[in-house]
């Protein structure tokens, strides 16, 4: 999978809008590895 | 507003540095991966590379790597952008840009800082 | 790198015109890819993510396709705003990279 920093945001938008936008304060792109995809 | 705003102009003679800074607000600066582009007149855009501002940690464009440095001071949420020894080539437009999830999902851009290289 | 072929480099065409224009990567990059408009003297502003999602905003006349290496940027019915130069961008990997732009001009 991709893990540059725009695939893990663009990765981690999706995760956000499937999830109705819950936001916890890690759950960022610059905190996010591509380890939890 | 999310707003990326980058310093002036610059001209510097071959062989200095230049340093360009980018301003960010409306946003939580550090949840977002910083990149930076350039474009030579009249050339397609190249990349330089990114840094995420909460660790610090930088990847580069193989191209510039030992000549630009990506740094970030997280209490001014600003960005920098320092290219040392400058050539004629160099001469383009810089832009920070940076996708944001929230407040909207969207890849801004800052207005670009342009830097002049000539003796 | 990852080399972005873009085509045609400039395209001639009228208000209410169908145009497309295509990139091609040198190897896969998935559907890691982006597009840029700019205009002279401003900033890219980006239209497409994904391949295919329009940022909001994004008029739905621009719309995107493509995947691995294959990918193609139209414009349903071009308005007089849309006169600029498009890039695309892969992401897949580093470093990223962009296609050489395609101008659309008046025709």
């Known amino acids: 999978a991709c893990d540059t920093a725009t695939c893990v945001t663009h990765r981690l938008a999706g995760l956000l809008s499937r999830s109705g936008g819950v936001v916890k304060n890690n759950f960022v792109p610059t905190n996010v590895g591509s380890k939890a995809f | 507003e999310v707003q990326l705003v980058q310093s002036g102009a610059e001209v510097k003679k071959p062989g200095a540095s230049v340093k360009v800074s980018c301003k960010a607000s409306g946003y939580t600066f550090t949840d977002y991966y910083m990149n930076w582009v350039r474009q030579a007149p009249g050339q397609r855009l190249e990349w330089i590379g990114d840094?995420?501002?909460?660790?610090?940690?930088?990847t580069y464009n193989q191209k510039f790597k030992g000549r630009a440095t990506l740094t970030v001071d997280k209490s001014a949420s600003t960005a920098y952008m320092e290219l040392s020894s400058l050539r004629s080539e160099d001469t383009a437009v810089y832009y920070c840009?940076?996708?944001?999830?929230?407040?909207?999902?969207?890849?801004?851009w800052g207005q670009g800082t342009t830097v002049t290289v000539s003796s | 790198d990852i080399q972005m072929t873009q085509s045609p480099s400039s395209v001639s065409a009228s208000v209410g015109d169908r145009v497309t224009i295509t990139c091609k990567a040198s190897q896969n990059v998935g559907s890691n890819v982006a597009w840029y408009q700019q205009k002279p003297g401003k900033s890219p502003k980006a239209l497409i993510y994904s391949a295919s999602y329009r940022y909001s905003g994004v008029p739905s006349r621009f719309s995107g396709s493509g995947s691995g290496t294959d990918f193609t940027l139209t414009i349903s019915s071009l308005q007089p705003e849309d006169f600029a130069t498009y890039y695309c961008?892969?992401?897949?990997?580093?470093?990223?990279?962009f296609g050489g732009g395609t101008k659309v001009e008046i025709k």
């Open positions: 840009a940076s996708i944001i999830i929230v407040p909207d999902y969207f890849d801004y």
């Open positions: 961008q892969q992401y897949n990997s580093y470093p990223y990279t």
């Open positions: 840094i995420n501002p909460n660790s610090g940690v930088t």
